[in-house]
Interface confidence: low
Protein backbone atom coordinates (compact mmCIF):
# COMPACT_ATOMS: atom_id res chain seq x y z
CA UNK A 1 0.00 0.00 0.00
CA UNK A 2 3.02 2.31 -0.01
CA UNK A 3 2.47 5.01 -2.65
CA UNK A 4 4.74 4.22 -5.59
CA UNK A 5 5.75 7.89 -6.04
CA UNK A 6 7.26 7.88 -2.55
CA UNK A 7 9.84 5.33 -3.72
CA UNK A 8 11.32 7.98 -5.99
CA UNK A 9 13.78 10.44 -4.37
CA UNK A 10 12.37 13.13 -6.67
CA UNK A 11 9.11 13.04 -4.72
CA UNK A 12 10.83 13.98 -1.45
CA UNK A 13 13.25 16.44 -3.01
CA UNK A 14 10.46 18.27 -4.82
CA UNK A 15 8.26 18.36 -1.73
CA UNK A 16 11.12 19.68 0.41
CA UNK A 17 12.05 22.27 -2.23
CA UNK A 18 8.46 23.57 -2.19
CA UNK A 19 8.54 23.78 1.60
CA UNK A 20 11.88 25.55 1.47
CA UNK A 21 10.54 28.02 -1.10
CA UNK A 22 7.60 28.80 1.15
CA UNK A 23 9.93 29.20 4.14
CA UNK A 24 12.15 31.63 2.25
CA UNK A 25 9.12 33.79 1.49
CA UNK A 26 8.17 34.16 5.15
CA UNK A 27 8.34 37.82 6.11
CA UNK A 28 7.88 38.84 9.74
CA UNK A 29 5.04 41.36 9.80
CA UNK A 30 5.95 44.65 11.47
CA UNK A 31 2.31 45.44 12.16
CA UNK A 32 0.31 45.06 15.34
CA UNK A 33 -2.42 42.45 15.70
CA UNK A 34 -5.93 43.86 15.77
CA UNK A 35 -7.34 40.49 16.85
CA UNK A 36 -5.97 37.73 19.07
CA UNK A 37 -7.13 34.12 19.08
CA UNK A 38 -5.65 31.47 21.34
CA UNK A 39 -6.70 27.90 20.62
CA UNK A 40 -5.99 25.69 23.62
CA UNK A 41 -6.01 21.93 23.19
CA UNK A 42 -6.28 20.75 26.77
CA UNK A 43 -3.85 17.85 27.20
CA UNK A 44 -2.88 17.99 23.53
CA UNK A 45 0.74 16.89 23.74
CA UNK A 46 2.82 16.25 20.62
CA UNK A 47 1.97 12.53 20.60
CA UNK A 48 -1.71 13.50 20.57
CA UNK A 49 -1.17 15.88 17.64
CA UNK A 50 0.64 13.19 15.65
CA UNK A 51 -1.95 10.51 16.34
CA UNK A 52 -4.81 12.91 15.54
CA UNK A 53 -3.14 13.85 12.26
CA UNK A 54 -3.03 10.19 11.26
CA UNK A 55 -6.65 9.66 12.32
CA UNK A 56 -7.78 12.73 10.38
CA UNK A 57 -6.05 11.36 7.27
CA UNK A 58 -7.43 7.88 7.75
CA UNK A 59 -10.95 9.26 8.09
CA UNK A 60 -10.42 10.64 4.56
CA UNK A 61 -9.20 7.24 3.31
CA UNK A 62 -5.57 8.34 3.29
CA UNK A 63 -2.66 6.48 4.86
CA UNK A 64 -2.41 9.03 7.65
CA UNK A 65 0.84 10.80 8.49
CA UNK A 66 1.16 12.70 5.23
CA UNK A 67 -2.06 14.56 6.08
CA UNK A 68 -1.97 18.16 7.30
CA UNK A 69 -3.91 19.31 10.29
CA UNK A 70 -5.05 22.95 10.16
CA UNK A 71 -2.55 23.72 12.93
CA UNK A 72 0.24 22.12 10.88
CA UNK A 73 -0.14 24.95 8.36
CA UNK A 74 0.86 27.59 10.89
CA UNK A 75 4.30 28.84 9.86
CA UNK A 76 5.93 29.41 13.25
CA UNK A 77 6.41 26.85 16.01
CA UNK A 78 7.98 26.89 19.46
CA UNK A 79 8.14 24.57 22.43
CA UNK A 80 6.55 25.57 25.73
CA UNK A 81 7.82 24.46 29.15
CA UNK A 82 4.70 23.67 31.13
CA UNK A 83 5.86 23.07 34.73
CA UNK A 84 4.16 25.02 37.50
CA UNK A 85 6.05 26.77 40.28
CA UNK A 86 5.50 23.85 42.66
CA UNK A 87 5.21 20.81 40.35
CA UNK A 88 7.22 19.32 37.48
CA UNK A 89 3.93 18.11 35.98
CA UNK A 90 1.20 20.76 36.11
CA UNK A 91 -2.58 20.98 36.08
CA UNK A 92 -4.81 23.09 33.86
CA UNK A 93 -5.23 25.85 36.45
CA UNK A 94 -1.58 26.74 36.94
CA UNK A 95 -0.94 26.46 33.20
CA UNK A 96 -3.91 28.70 32.34
CA UNK A 97 -2.40 31.34 34.59
CA UNK A 98 0.87 31.01 32.66
CA UNK A 99 -0.38 31.23 29.06
CA UNK A 100 -3.25 33.66 29.75
CA UNK A 101 -1.74 35.92 32.41
CA UNK A 102 1.98 35.56 31.72
CA UNK A 103 2.91 34.50 35.28
CA UNK A 104 3.44 30.99 36.64
CA UNK A 105 1.42 29.91 39.64
CA UNK A 106 0.91 26.90 41.87
CA UNK A 107 -0.88 23.64 41.12
CA UNK A 108 -4.70 23.96 41.06
CA UNK A 109 -4.76 27.74 41.55
CA UNK A 110 -6.00 30.12 38.86
CA UNK A 111 -5.17 33.73 38.08
CA UNK A 112 -2.87 34.07 41.06
CA UNK A 113 0.89 34.30 41.43
CA UNK A 114 2.76 31.55 43.25
CA UNK A 115 2.57 33.59 46.45
CA UNK A 116 -0.97 32.25 46.71
CA UNK A 117 -1.45 28.80 48.25
CA UNK A 118 -3.85 26.12 47.06
CA UNK A 119 -7.11 26.13 49.03
CA UNK A 120 -5.99 28.92 51.39
CA UNK A 121 -8.52 31.68 50.81
CA UNK A 122 -6.59 34.30 52.77
CA UNK A 123 -3.68 34.10 50.31
CA UNK A 124 -5.81 35.35 47.41
CA UNK A 125 -5.78 39.06 48.03
CA UNK A 126 -2.90 41.00 46.51
CA UNK A 127 -1.70 38.01 44.47
CA UNK A 128 -4.08 38.40 41.53
CA UNK A 129 -2.53 38.49 38.07
CA UNK A 130 -4.41 39.99 35.13
CA UNK A 131 -5.15 38.06 31.95
CA UNK A 132 -4.46 39.24 28.41
CA UNK A 133 -8.21 38.96 27.81
CA UNK A 134 -8.85 41.45 30.60
CA UNK A 135 -6.21 43.79 29.19
CA UNK A 136 -7.74 43.46 25.71
CA UNK A 137 -11.13 44.45 27.13
CA UNK A 138 -9.61 47.50 28.83
CA UNK A 139 -8.15 48.47 25.45
CA UNK A 140 -11.63 48.53 23.93
CA UNK A 141 -11.64 45.14 22.24
CA UNK A 142 -14.48 42.64 22.42
CA UNK A 143 -13.63 39.40 24.20
CA UNK A 144 -14.92 35.86 24.20
CA UNK A 145 -14.48 32.44 25.78
CA UNK A 146 -15.46 29.24 23.98
CA UNK A 147 -14.94 25.76 25.42
CA UNK A 148 -16.25 22.20 25.29
CA UNK A 149 -15.91 21.96 29.08
CA UNK A 150 -17.77 23.98 31.68
CA UNK A 151 -17.11 27.68 31.13
CA UNK A 152 -16.08 27.74 34.81
CA UNK A 153 -13.43 25.06 34.20
CA UNK A 154 -9.76 25.71 34.92
CA UNK A 155 -8.59 26.71 31.43
CA UNK A 156 -11.29 29.27 30.56
CA UNK A 157 -11.30 30.53 34.16
CA UNK A 158 -7.71 31.64 33.67
CA UNK A 159 -9.06 34.38 31.43
CA UNK A 160 -11.27 35.98 34.09
CA UNK A 161 -11.00 34.40 37.54
CA UNK A 162 -8.72 34.48 40.56
CA UNK A 163 -9.09 31.52 42.88
CA UNK A 164 -6.99 29.40 45.20
CA UNK A 165 -9.03 26.34 44.26
CA UNK A 166 -9.97 25.51 40.67
CA UNK A 167 -12.79 23.27 41.93
CA UNK A 168 -14.82 26.15 43.39
CA UNK A 169 -17.24 26.17 40.44
CA UNK A 170 -20.28 27.44 42.34
CA UNK A 171 -20.72 28.70 45.89
CA UNK A 172 -21.80 25.19 46.89
CA UNK A 173 -18.23 24.07 46.20
CA UNK A 174 -16.65 26.78 48.37
CA UNK A 175 -16.21 25.94 52.08
CA UNK A 176 -18.25 28.18 54.39
CA UNK A 177 -15.05 29.50 55.99
CA UNK A 178 -13.71 30.61 52.62
CA UNK A 179 -17.06 32.18 51.70
CA UNK A 180 -17.00 34.14 54.96
CA UNK A 181 -13.49 35.34 54.17
CA UNK A 182 -14.82 36.69 50.89
CA UNK A 183 -13.56 34.12 48.40
CA UNK A 184 -15.93 33.93 45.46
CA UNK A 185 -16.84 30.93 43.36
CA UNK A 186 -15.74 30.89 39.71
CA UNK A 187 -19.27 31.22 38.30
CA UNK A 188 -19.77 34.45 40.25
CA UNK A 189 -16.44 35.75 39.00
CA UNK A 190 -17.45 34.88 35.44
CA UNK A 191 -20.19 37.51 35.52
CA UNK A 192 -18.71 40.05 37.94
CA UNK A 193 -14.97 40.32 37.38
CA UNK A 194 -15.11 41.71 33.87
CA UNK A 195 -17.39 42.27 30.93
CA UNK A 196 -17.11 39.24 28.62
CA UNK A 197 -18.98 39.67 25.34
CA UNK A 198 -19.27 36.00 24.36
CA UNK A 199 -19.39 33.02 26.73
CA UNK A 200 -20.03 29.63 25.11
CA UNK A 201 -19.66 26.13 26.55
CA UNK A 202 -21.12 24.01 29.32
CA UNK A 203 -21.76 24.78 32.98
CA UNK A 204 -25.45 25.68 33.35
CA UNK A 205 -25.90 24.15 36.79
CA UNK A 206 -23.41 26.46 38.50
CA UNK A 207 -25.37 29.54 37.42
CA UNK A 208 -28.75 28.74 38.96
CA UNK A 209 -30.13 28.28 42.49
CA UNK A 210 -30.44 24.84 44.03
CA UNK A 211 -33.73 23.29 42.99
CA UNK A 212 -33.88 25.02 39.59
CA UNK A 213 -34.62 22.27 37.05
CA UNK A 214 -32.36 22.07 34.01
CA UNK A 215 -34.20 22.94 30.77
CA UNK A 216 -32.77 19.93 28.92
CA UNK A 217 -32.98 17.38 31.75
CA UNK A 218 -35.86 18.69 33.91
CA UNK A 219 -36.49 15.34 35.60
CA UNK A 220 -32.87 14.77 36.60
CA UNK A 221 -32.38 16.51 39.93
CA UNK A 222 -28.60 16.04 39.78
CA UNK A 223 -28.44 18.23 36.67
CA UNK A 224 -30.33 21.16 38.20
CA UNK A 225 -28.99 24.33 39.78
CA UNK A 226 -26.38 24.00 42.52
CA UNK A 227 -26.19 27.49 43.99
CA UNK A 228 -26.79 27.98 47.72
CA UNK A 229 -26.94 31.79 47.60
CA UNK A 230 -30.23 31.75 45.69
CA UNK A 231 -28.74 33.78 42.86
CA UNK A 232 -29.64 33.38 39.21
CA UNK A 233 -26.33 34.45 37.70
CA UNK A 234 -27.64 34.27 34.15
CA UNK A 235 -30.39 36.72 35.05
CA UNK A 236 -27.87 39.01 36.73
CA UNK A 237 -25.65 38.88 33.66
CA UNK A 238 -28.55 39.62 31.30
CA UNK A 239 -29.51 42.64 33.40
CA UNK A 240 -26.07 44.18 32.88
CA UNK A 241 -26.35 44.56 29.11
CA UNK A 242 -29.27 45.74 27.02
CA UNK A 243 -28.23 43.60 24.05
CA UNK A 244 -27.48 40.46 26.07
CA UNK A 245 -28.95 37.10 25.17
CA UNK A 246 -28.77 33.71 26.87
CA UNK A 247 -29.22 30.50 24.85
CA UNK A 248 -29.01 26.86 25.82
CA UNK A 249 -29.32 24.93 22.56
CA UNK A 250 -27.84 24.89 19.08
CA UNK A 251 -30.84 26.39 17.27
CA UNK A 252 -30.98 29.40 19.59
CA UNK A 253 -27.21 29.86 19.24
CA UNK A 254 -27.30 29.96 15.45
CA UNK A 255 -30.20 32.43 15.54
CA UNK A 256 -28.54 34.69 18.10
CA UNK A 257 -25.22 34.77 16.26
CA UNK A 258 -26.96 36.25 13.21
CA UNK A 259 -29.06 38.78 15.15
CA UNK A 260 -27.53 42.28 14.93
CA UNK A 261 -29.31 43.37 18.12
CA UNK A 262 -27.31 40.85 20.18
CA UNK A 263 -24.22 42.51 21.65
CA UNK A 264 -23.48 39.99 24.41
CA UNK A 265 -24.07 36.25 24.14
CA UNK A 266 -23.99 33.53 26.76
CA UNK A 267 -24.63 29.99 25.57
CA UNK A 268 -24.54 27.16 28.12
CA UNK A 269 -25.37 23.91 26.39
CA UNK A 270 -24.99 21.31 29.14
CA UNK A 271 -25.33 21.33 32.94
CA UNK A 272 -21.65 20.39 33.26
CA UNK A 273 -19.10 19.71 30.54
CA UNK A 274 -20.39 19.42 27.01
CA UNK A 275 -20.69 15.94 25.58
CA UNK A 276 -17.82 14.32 23.72
CA UNK A 277 -18.06 14.99 20.00
CA UNK A 278 -18.85 11.31 19.36
CA UNK A 279 -21.81 11.49 21.76
CA UNK A 280 -23.06 14.97 20.86
CA UNK A 281 -26.73 15.36 19.90
CA UNK A 282 -26.23 17.61 16.89
CA UNK A 283 -29.82 18.87 17.05
CA UNK A 284 -29.39 20.17 20.61
CA UNK A 285 -25.71 20.94 21.16
CA UNK A 286 -23.42 22.92 18.85
CA UNK A 287 -19.98 21.61 17.94
CA UNK A 288 -16.83 23.45 18.93
CA UNK A 289 -16.55 24.59 15.32
CA UNK A 290 -20.07 26.04 15.39
CA UNK A 291 -19.46 27.80 18.72
CA UNK A 292 -16.22 29.26 17.37
CA UNK A 293 -17.98 30.55 14.27
CA UNK A 294 -20.80 32.09 16.33
CA UNK A 295 -18.26 33.81 18.59
CA UNK A 296 -16.33 35.21 15.64
CA UNK A 297 -19.49 36.54 14.01
CA UNK A 298 -20.26 38.59 17.11
CA UNK A 299 -16.76 39.63 18.10
CA UNK A 300 -15.65 40.71 14.65
CA UNK A 301 -18.21 43.53 14.66
CA UNK A 302 -15.93 45.58 16.91
CA UNK A 303 -13.71 47.87 14.79
CA UNK A 304 -11.11 47.85 17.57
CA UNK A 305 -10.73 44.08 17.30
CA UNK A 306 -11.21 41.18 19.66
CA UNK A 307 -9.61 38.56 21.90
CA UNK A 308 -10.97 35.01 21.68
CA UNK A 309 -10.09 31.95 23.74
CA UNK A 310 -11.15 28.65 22.14
CA UNK A 311 -10.62 25.43 24.07
CA UNK A 312 -10.85 21.84 22.97
CA UNK A 313 -11.20 20.94 26.61
CA UNK A 314 -12.21 17.31 26.49
CA UNK A 315 -9.11 16.00 24.72
CA UNK A 316 -7.80 15.93 28.27
CA UNK A 317 -10.83 14.04 29.57
CA UNK A 318 -10.51 11.33 26.93
CA UNK A 319 -6.90 10.80 27.93
CA UNK A 320 -7.69 10.70 31.66
CA UNK A 321 -10.10 7.85 30.86
CA UNK A 322 -7.36 6.18 28.74
CA UNK A 323 -9.80 6.25 25.84
CA UNK A 324 -7.65 7.41 22.96
CA UNK A 325 -10.58 7.29 20.55
CA UNK A 326 -12.32 10.04 22.52
CA UNK A 327 -9.18 12.14 22.94
CA UNK A 328 -8.31 11.97 19.25
CA UNK A 329 -11.81 12.65 17.93
CA UNK A 330 -11.93 15.67 20.25
CA UNK A 331 -8.59 16.79 18.82
CA UNK A 332 -9.93 16.56 15.28
CA UNK A 333 -12.97 18.69 16.14
CA UNK A 334 -10.60 21.16 17.79
CA UNK A 335 -8.59 21.25 14.58
CA UNK A 336 -11.78 21.75 12.55
CA UNK A 337 -12.53 24.80 14.70
CA UNK A 338 -9.05 26.16 13.97
CA UNK A 339 -9.64 25.64 10.26
CA UNK A 340 -13.02 27.41 10.36
CA UNK A 341 -11.59 30.34 12.29
CA UNK A 342 -8.88 30.64 9.65
CA UNK A 343 -11.56 30.97 6.98
CA UNK A 344 -13.39 33.67 8.95
CA UNK A 345 -10.35 35.80 9.83
CA UNK A 346 -7.34 37.23 8.05
CA UNK A 347 -3.75 36.55 9.02
CA UNK A 348 -3.08 40.16 8.05
CA UNK A 349 -4.68 41.42 11.25
CA UNK A 350 -5.24 38.34 13.44
CA UNK A 351 -2.59 36.64 15.53
CA UNK A 352 -3.66 33.02 16.02
CA UNK A 353 -1.86 30.74 18.45
CA UNK A 354 -2.47 27.03 18.98
CA UNK A 355 -1.03 25.30 22.00
CA UNK A 356 -1.64 22.84 24.81
CA UNK A 357 -1.58 23.45 28.52
CA UNK A 358 0.21 20.17 29.18
CA UNK A 359 0.72 16.72 27.72
CA UNK A 360 -0.42 13.22 28.77
CA UNK A 361 1.42 9.95 29.32
CA UNK A 362 0.13 8.83 25.92
CA UNK A 363 2.44 7.07 23.52
CA UNK A 364 2.38 5.96 19.91
CA UNK A 365 4.84 3.26 18.93
CA UNK A 366 5.54 -0.37 18.12
CA UNK A 367 6.49 -0.09 14.40
CA UNK A 368 2.99 -0.24 12.89
CA UNK A 369 2.76 -0.50 9.12
CA UNK A 370 2.00 2.69 7.19
CA UNK A 371 -1.74 2.96 6.65
CA UNK A 372 -2.63 0.60 9.48
CA UNK A 373 -5.34 1.89 11.82
CA UNK A 374 -4.13 4.31 14.45
CA UNK A 375 -6.25 2.29 16.89
CA UNK A 376 -4.80 -1.00 15.66
CA UNK A 377 -2.23 -3.48 16.84
CA UNK A 378 1.52 -3.44 16.48
CA UNK A 379 2.93 -6.15 14.23
CA UNK A 380 4.04 -9.25 16.08
CA UNK A 381 3.53 -10.16 19.70
CA UNK A 382 4.90 -8.94 23.00
CA UNK A 383 7.12 -11.12 25.24
CA UNK A 384 3.99 -12.52 26.85
CA UNK A 385 2.95 -13.75 23.37
CA UNK A 386 -0.02 -11.41 23.29
CA UNK A 387 -0.89 -8.60 20.93
CA UNK A 388 -0.49 -4.96 21.93
CA UNK A 389 -1.84 -1.69 20.59
CA UNK A 390 0.28 1.03 19.02
CA UNK A 391 -1.39 3.54 21.33
CA UNK A 392 -0.65 3.02 25.01
CA UNK A 393 -0.59 4.96 28.29
CA UNK A 394 2.15 5.04 30.89
CA UNK A 395 -0.44 4.85 33.65
CA UNK A 396 -4.19 4.89 34.03
CA UNK A 397 -7.36 2.82 34.23
CA UNK A 398 -6.37 0.70 31.22
CA UNK A 399 -4.25 -1.47 33.50
CA UNK A 400 -6.21 -4.69 33.84
CA UNK A 401 -5.17 -8.12 35.05
CA UNK A 402 -6.97 -11.18 33.72
CA UNK A 403 -6.03 -14.38 35.51
CA UNK A 404 -3.01 -12.55 36.89
CA UNK A 405 -1.78 -11.45 33.48
CA UNK A 406 -2.20 -8.76 30.87
CA UNK A 407 -5.24 -9.51 28.70
CA UNK A 408 -4.82 -10.20 25.01
CA UNK A 409 -6.38 -7.70 22.62
CA UNK A 410 -7.87 -7.99 19.15
CA UNK A 411 -8.13 -5.36 16.40
CA UNK A 412 -11.91 -5.22 16.76
CA UNK A 413 -11.64 -4.57 20.50
CA UNK A 414 -8.99 -1.88 20.16
CA UNK A 415 -10.98 -0.07 17.45
CA UNK A 416 -14.00 0.43 19.70
CA UNK A 417 -14.68 4.02 20.83
CA UNK A 418 -15.05 2.71 24.38
CA UNK A 419 -11.76 0.77 24.44
CA UNK A 420 -9.26 1.78 27.11
CA UNK A 421 -5.67 1.43 25.97
CA UNK A 422 -3.51 -0.52 28.37
CA UNK A 423 -1.11 1.06 30.81
CA UNK A 424 1.91 0.01 32.85
CA UNK A 425 0.63 1.35 36.18
CA UNK A 426 -2.93 1.09 37.54
CA UNK A 427 -4.55 4.44 38.36
CA UNK A 428 -8.18 5.53 38.47
CA UNK A 429 -7.31 8.36 36.11
CA UNK A 430 -4.39 8.61 33.71
CA UNK A 431 -2.09 11.52 34.50
CA UNK A 432 -0.74 14.55 32.75
CA UNK A 433 2.82 14.41 31.45
CA UNK A 434 5.58 16.92 31.91
CA UNK A 435 7.27 17.16 28.53
CA UNK A 436 7.22 20.37 26.50
CA UNK A 437 4.25 21.05 24.24
CA UNK A 438 4.09 22.77 20.87
CA UNK A 439 2.99 26.35 20.21
CA UNK A 440 1.89 27.07 16.63
CA UNK A 441 1.58 30.69 15.46
CA UNK A 442 0.25 32.61 12.47
CA UNK A 443 -0.37 36.30 11.86
CA UNK A 444 1.16 39.58 13.02
CA UNK A 445 4.17 39.02 15.31
CA UNK A 446 3.89 35.23 14.94
CA UNK A 447 7.62 35.17 14.18
CA UNK A 448 8.26 35.84 17.87
CA UNK A 449 7.08 32.31 18.57
CA UNK A 450 10.35 30.41 18.29
CA UNK A 451 12.73 28.26 20.29
CA UNK A 452 12.08 26.73 23.68
CA UNK A 453 10.19 29.13 25.92
CA UNK A 454 8.47 29.27 29.25
CA UNK A 455 4.71 28.85 28.89
CA UNK A 456 4.32 32.41 30.20
CA UNK A 457 5.91 33.69 26.97
CA UNK A 458 2.63 32.99 25.15
CA UNK A 459 0.71 35.64 27.09
CA UNK A 460 3.50 38.14 26.56
CA UNK A 461 3.60 37.53 22.80
CA UNK A 462 -0.15 38.15 22.61
CA UNK A 463 0.06 41.30 24.72
CA UNK A 464 2.98 42.67 22.73
CA UNK A 465 1.44 41.83 19.35
CA UNK A 466 -1.71 43.79 20.20
CA UNK A 467 0.13 46.55 22.11
CA UNK A 468 -1.66 45.70 25.34
CA UNK A 469 -0.34 46.30 28.85
CA UNK A 470 2.54 46.21 29.64
CA UNK A 471 3.53 46.71 25.99
CA UNK A 472 1.38 49.72 25.13
CA UNK A 473 4.57 51.36 23.80
CA UNK A 474 5.06 48.41 21.43
CA UNK A 475 6.20 50.61 18.52
CA UNK A 476 4.35 48.45 16.00
CA UNK A 477 2.64 49.99 13.00
CA UNK A 478 -1.13 49.63 13.04
CA UNK A 479 -2.35 47.38 10.26
CA UNK A 480 -3.34 49.31 7.14
CA UNK A 481 -7.05 50.01 7.31
CA UNK A 482 -7.32 49.46 11.06
CA UNK A 483 -10.20 51.46 12.46
CA UNK A 484 -10.54 52.83 15.96
Amino acid sequence: IIPVEEENPDFWNRQAAEALGAAKKLQPAQTAAKNLIIFLGDGMGVSTVTAARILKGQKKDKLGPETFLAMDRFPYVALSKTYSVDKHVPDSGATATAYLCGVKGNFQTIGLSAAARFNQCNTTRGNEVISVMNRAKKAGKSVGVVTTTRVQHASPAGAYAHTVNRNWYSDADVPASARQEGCQDIATQLISNMDIDVILGGGRKYMFPMGTPDPEYPDDYSQGGTRLDGKNLVQEWLAKHQGARYVWNRTELLQASLDPSVTHLMGLFEPGDMKYEIHRDSTLDPSLMEMTEAALLLLSRNPRGFFLFVEGGRIDHGHHESRAYRALTETIMFDDAIERAGQLTSEEDTLSLVTADHSHVFSFGGYPLRGSSIFGLAPGKARDRKAYTVLLYGNGPGYVLKDGARPDVTESESGSPEYRQQSAVPLDGETHAGEDVAVFARGPQAHLVHGVQEQTFIAHVMAFAACLEPYTACDLAPRAGTTD
Partner: nanobody, 122 residues
Protein backbone atom coordinates in the same frame (compact mmCIF):
# COMPACT_ATOMS: atom_id res chain seq x y z
CA UNK B 1 -22.72 46.45 44.29
CA UNK B 2 -19.53 48.33 45.18
CA UNK B 3 -20.12 50.98 47.85
CA UNK B 4 -18.00 54.09 48.49
CA UNK B 5 -18.69 56.06 51.64
CA UNK B 6 -16.98 59.40 52.35
CA UNK B 7 -16.72 61.01 55.77
CA UNK B 8 -14.81 63.76 57.54
CA UNK B 9 -16.20 66.81 55.79
CA UNK B 10 -17.42 69.87 57.65
CA UNK B 11 -17.01 73.57 58.34
CA UNK B 12 -13.50 74.82 59.11
CA UNK B 13 -11.80 78.19 59.30
CA UNK B 14 -9.19 79.23 56.74
CA UNK B 15 -5.78 77.90 57.76
CA UNK B 16 -7.35 74.94 59.56
CA UNK B 17 -7.20 71.21 58.79
CA UNK B 18 -9.56 68.36 57.96
CA UNK B 19 -9.09 64.66 57.26
CA UNK B 20 -11.43 63.02 54.78
CA UNK B 21 -11.94 59.25 54.62
CA UNK B 22 -13.37 57.06 51.89
CA UNK B 23 -14.19 53.42 52.53
CA UNK B 24 -14.72 51.06 49.58
CA UNK B 25 -16.72 47.99 50.56
CA UNK B 26 -18.57 45.12 48.87
CA UNK B 27 -16.09 45.12 45.99
CA UNK B 28 -15.88 41.81 44.09
CA UNK B 29 -12.34 42.73 43.05
CA UNK B 30 -9.27 44.64 44.25
CA UNK B 31 -9.26 48.39 43.68
CA UNK B 32 -6.75 49.84 41.24
CA UNK B 33 -6.42 53.64 41.45
CA UNK B 34 -8.28 55.71 44.03
CA UNK B 35 -8.76 59.46 43.81
CA UNK B 36 -10.36 62.52 45.36
CA UNK B 37 -12.27 64.96 43.18
CA UNK B 38 -14.00 68.15 44.21
CA UNK B 39 -16.74 70.34 42.80
CA UNK B 40 -17.19 73.96 43.86
CA UNK B 41 -20.56 75.66 43.26
CA UNK B 42 -20.94 76.55 39.58
CA UNK B 43 -17.65 74.84 38.70
CA UNK B 44 -16.77 71.56 36.99
CA UNK B 45 -15.61 68.59 38.99
CA UNK B 46 -11.79 68.58 39.22
CA UNK B 47 -9.16 66.06 40.25
CA UNK B 48 -7.56 66.85 43.61
CA UNK B 49 -5.29 63.87 44.25
CA UNK B 50 -4.83 60.31 43.02
CA UNK B 51 -3.10 57.25 44.46
CA UNK B 52 -2.24 54.03 42.66
CA UNK B 53 -2.41 50.49 43.99
CA UNK B 54 1.35 50.58 44.51
CA UNK B 55 1.08 53.82 46.49
CA UNK B 56 2.40 56.37 43.99
CA UNK B 57 0.60 59.72 44.22
CA UNK B 58 -0.19 62.79 42.15
CA UNK B 59 -1.71 66.14 43.15
CA UNK B 60 -3.40 69.12 41.51
CA UNK B 61 -1.04 72.11 41.50
CA UNK B 62 -3.40 74.10 43.73
CA UNK B 63 -3.10 71.63 46.65
CA UNK B 64 0.53 70.50 46.35
CA UNK B 65 2.34 70.75 49.67
CA UNK B 66 -0.90 71.19 51.61
CA UNK B 67 -2.84 67.98 50.95
CA UNK B 68 -1.65 64.38 51.46
CA UNK B 69 -3.43 61.35 49.99
CA UNK B 70 -2.95 57.86 51.45
CA UNK B 71 -4.68 54.50 51.34
CA UNK B 72 -4.94 51.25 53.21
CA UNK B 73 -5.88 47.99 51.51
CA UNK B 74 -7.09 45.49 54.08
CA UNK B 75 -5.21 42.22 54.04
CA UNK B 76 -8.31 40.04 54.20
CA UNK B 77 -10.00 38.64 51.13
CA UNK B 78 -13.02 40.94 51.50
CA UNK B 79 -11.83 43.49 48.98
CA UNK B 80 -11.89 46.57 51.18
CA UNK B 81 -9.85 49.72 50.64
CA UNK B 82 -9.79 52.93 52.64
CA UNK B 83 -8.41 56.20 51.31
CA UNK B 84 -7.63 59.37 53.23
CA UNK B 85 -7.05 62.99 52.32
CA UNK B 86 -5.27 65.07 54.97
CA UNK B 87 -5.95 68.72 54.17
CA UNK B 88 -3.76 71.32 55.90
CA UNK B 89 -3.68 75.13 55.59
CA UNK B 90 -7.13 75.15 54.04
CA UNK B 91 -8.08 78.11 51.84
CA UNK B 92 -11.44 79.58 50.89
CA UNK B 93 -10.97 78.17 47.36
CA UNK B 94 -10.92 74.63 48.80
CA UNK B 95 -14.65 74.84 49.52
CA UNK B 96 -16.75 72.29 47.63
CA UNK B 97 -18.15 68.78 47.62
CA UNK B 98 -15.33 66.21 47.75
CA UNK B 99 -16.00 62.96 45.93
CA UNK B 100 -14.22 59.64 46.31
CA UNK B 101 -13.43 57.73 43.10
CA UNK B 102 -12.20 54.14 42.73
CA UNK B 103 -11.39 52.01 39.70
CA UNK B 104 -11.92 48.22 39.73
CA UNK B 105 -8.73 46.36 38.92
CA UNK B 106 -10.29 43.65 36.79
CA UNK B 107 -12.92 45.51 34.85
CA UNK B 108 -11.64 49.10 34.75
CA UNK B 109 -15.05 50.31 35.96
CA UNK B 110 -15.23 53.62 37.83
CA UNK B 111 -17.12 53.86 41.10
CA UNK B 112 -18.13 57.10 42.88
CA UNK B 113 -19.15 58.06 46.36
CA UNK B 114 -22.03 60.42 47.21
CA UNK B 115 -19.68 63.23 48.25
CA UNK B 116 -18.89 65.04 51.49
CA UNK B 117 -19.18 68.83 51.90
CA UNK B 118 -16.10 70.86 52.90
CA UNK B 119 -16.69 74.53 53.71
CA UNK B 120 -13.81 76.88 54.48
CA UNK B 121 -14.85 80.15 56.08
CA UNK B 122 -12.94 83.32 56.73
Amino acid sequence: QVQLVESGGGLVQAGGSLRLSCEVTRSPMPIDTMAWYRQAPGRQRELVAIISRSGSTNYADSVKGRFTISRNDTKSTMYKSTMYLKMNTLELEDTGVYYCNAVGLWNGAEYWGQGTQVTVSS
